[in-house]
């Protein structure tokens, strides 16, 4: 009798021990995971995060669609709606260069760096060549008339515009439009001005920064968060809190991301900080990620979202700050009338696009999203989409703009910058992070469930035997 009872009790004890061990392993395992993650996401020599941060292992592509103007003469002569036809994609490989001037500052636990710019054309991923021609707004004419509203200066400019045979629109190759060309009108200006113009001029052989970000050594919750940009905590482009540099650069976020979080990040392309909110769970190459999207609220007018009041910097074009979906970044572009929006004026007010024909906004193609692995905070896939527009206004001093009867926010191009973790990297990530966490979770569950089942089964058997013996 004793042997059987002893055996049952031993079984129950083993079950209990397994269950307790499984239960203990949960917080202990979580602690181990947290400890490992905290160690590996710090931005210092020797960590996984640092290696990928210095030079992204992901191939990043920037696709461009150019808005080819179909009716330049009618616009110039009759102030007609601008008819555009998008042509693209024209694809470039970008962000392939390693960060430069990386300097750790142990005093304040930051690391500073420059992000070099470079773009390599990818013909196989493009619809044409860099020599393709497009009819686009004359960037120099539109900008000059805006920067110099003074009537005297405009009369002088008008004579130079006419002399150079420039017009409201121009024909340019893709390479010229993106990376720069010598403008014939600006070449005649008798005082010192840059005669080269381009949507991204200068780009190659330049760098963005200096960025100074927290390395996470003192507090992992601050890792990758920008401390200063170009030596300042503010941008000097906006009023009040709109001018703050918030969050990271969106390449990664502090680890242990929650769905309820609002992820702040700074984008030098749009000269402001912005935010993303959780949208859905996504499985990316076997890795569970959170999809965060830029909400329409971020592009709303101050009427709809009072938080945006300091992004409205002028009253006329914005119709007393009631227009939405476009951001005037002229302060950040030496006074050039550049407006940023989502492609095809997605989330923009009807008055913005009423002067343009041929646009078809849709969320799937034109919104921006970030797919973030929540444990590490790494952005494993993203699509950054934005449109660059230029304001052109009537001018009764500049002949080629004289017949315009209204303001136009003219779309020049839109871009889609994408990056997705490669298959090899994903496999490595699965085995090193997801796999280990899943394995640990599995062991915890097996121990706990086997332990509980054993304990309950042996205890029932023991009780049954005891009651038989007593009878």
């Amino acid at each position: 009798g004793c042997d059987r009872n002893c055996g049952l009790i031993t079984g129950a004890v083993i079950g209990a021990v397994l269950a307790v061990f499984g239960g203990i392993l949960m917080p202990v395992g979580d602690m181990l995971i947290q400890k490992t993650i905290k160690k590996e996401v710090v931005l210092e020599e020797g960590t996984i995060a640092f290696k990928n941060w210095v030079k992204t292992g992901t191939e990043i592509y920037r696709q461009f669609w150019i808005f080819d103007v179909q009716n330049p003469q009618e616009v110039m002569m009759n102030s007609s709606n601008i008819q555009v036809k998008q042509r693209g994609p024209y694809t470039y490989r970008v962000r392939f260069l390693a960060k430069e001037n990386i300097t750790q500052d142990p005093k304040d636990n930051t690391v500073s760096f420059l992000q070099p710019n470079g773009a390599i054309f990818e013909p196989s991923l493009s619809v044409g060549t860099e020599a393709d021609n497009f009819t686009v707004l004359n960037l120099a004419v539109a900008a000059a008339s805006h920067i110099y509203p003074n009537p005297f200066v405009q009369v002088v400019l008008n004579s130079l515009i006419n002399k150079s045979k420039s017009s409201m629109f121009q024909v340019r190759t893709l390479r010229e439009l993106l990376w720069g060309y010598t403008d014939p009108f600006l070449s005649l200006v008798p005082y010192p001005v840059s005669t080269r113009v381009g949507m991204f001029y200068p780009y190659n052989n330049t760098a963005d920064g200096v960025y100074k970000v927290f390395n996470g050594k003192d507090s992992i919750s601050k890792v990758a968060i920008i401390d200063t940009y170009k030596g300042k905590r503010n941008l000097s482009y906006w009023e009040s809190y709109c001018d703050m540099i918030n969050g990271t650069d969106a390449a990664s976020f502090p680890p242990f991301v929650e769905k309820s979080q609002v992820l702040q990040f700074f984008s030098s392309d749009i000269c402001r900080s912005i935010y993303a909110v959780f949208e859905s769970d996504v499985n990316l190459k076997g890795i569970p990620v959170y999809r965060f999207v830029l909400p329409s609220k971020a592009f709303a007018s101050p009427v709809q979202n009072p938080d945006n009041h300091c992004f409205c910097t002028e009253k006329i074009i914005s119709k007393n700050c009631t227009s939405y979906g476009v951001l005037d970044i002229s302060k950040c572009k030496e006074g050039k009338p550049v407006y940023i929006s989502l492609p095809h004026f997605l989330y923009a007010s009807p008055d913005v696009s009423e002067t343009i024909d041929g646009l078809n906004p849709n969320e799937e193609e034109h919104r921006t999203y970030l797919d973030i692995e929540p444990i590490t905070g790494f952005t494993l896939q993203f699509a950054k989409r934005l449109q660059v527009n230029l304001l052109v206004k009537p001018s009764n001093k500049i002949q080629v703009l004289k017949r315009l009867k209204r303001n136009y926010i003219v779309p020049i191009l839109w871009l889609n910058e994408t990056g997705t973790i490669g298959d090899e990297k994903a496999k490595m990530f699965r085995s090193q992070v997801t796999g280990k966490i899943n394995l640990l979770g599995l062991i915890e569950m097996i121990l706990l469930s086997v332990g509980v089942v054993m304990f309950v089964a042996f205890m029932i058997s023991y009780c049954a035997c005891r009651s038989k013996t007593i009878k």
Partner: antibody
């Protein structure tokens, strides 16, 4: 309010030079063009030229090229016009006049009488 | 260079009468015509700017019209304070050019 105050009358000998000043106050000096206008006794007005202080861009009436030189001193918000190789033909009242955002000669100085006499 | 021909050179008008001054330009200047008033011993004063725009503070009896090459300046009912020289200025192109002026006197 916006004021343009010109230097006093000048009596100069033929062949000499003269530099007239126009001191401004009450506005952002660099953002508006400063023009100079000549008015001979009992005659109409003639535009000499203009200068945009922001970048120093100048434009002259061909008739006054070589005769007038326009300059500015941003630190003191003052515009200057120098007239050289003076003859009796140059005897006149010279005005400085400033643009407004979209308006020509919105504000005027009180005028400086230049008399060229041996 | 755009030449501006202003007429008449002088005009003698009784109080309450209508005054019309005309300026004709040698080139098409759209509506880039301005009108100035100059009283003795004073600098000119802008009355009407481009686009036939009456400047703030200028009495509504002053008006102008015209487009292209033919422009008219009108004083609806003459007052003694309107005695002055009047000049038109074309601001379409450089050099800026003035009309020869019209001397307006009381009859």
């Amino acid at each position: 309010q916006i004021q343009l105050v010109q230097s006093g009358p000048e009596l100069v000998k033929p062949g000499a030079s003269v530099k007239i000043s126009c001191e401004t106050s009450g506005h952002t000096f660099t953002e508006y063009t400063m023009h100079w206008v000549k008015q001979s006794h009992g005659k109409s007005l003639e535009w000499i030229g203009g200068i945009y202080p922001n970048n120093g861009a100048t434009k002259y009436n061909q008739k006054f090229k070589g005769k007038a030189t326009l300059t500015v001193d941003k630190s003191s918000s003052t515009a200057y016009m120098e007239l050289r190789s003076l003859t009796s033909e140059d005897s006149a009242v010279y005005y400085c006049a400033r643009d407004r955002y979209d308006v020509w000669f919105a504000y005027w100085g009180q005028g400086t009488l230049v008399t060229v006499s041996a | 260079e755009t030449t501006v021909t202003q007429s008449p050179a002088s005009l003698s008008v009784a109080t309450g009468e209508k005054v019309t001054i005309r300026c004709i330009t040698s080139t098409d200047i759209d509506d880039d015509m301005n009108w100035y008033q100059q009283k003795p011993g004073e600098p000119p004063k802008l009355l009407i700017s481009e686009g036939n725009t009456l400047r703030p503070g200028v009495p509504s009896r002053f008006s102008s019209g015209g487009y292209g090459t033919d422009f008219v300046f009108t004083v609806e009912n003459m007052l003694s304070e309107d005695v002055a020289d009047y000049y038109c200025l074309q601001s379409d192109n450089l050099p800026l050019t003035f009309g020869a002026g019209t001397k307006l006197e009381l009859k």
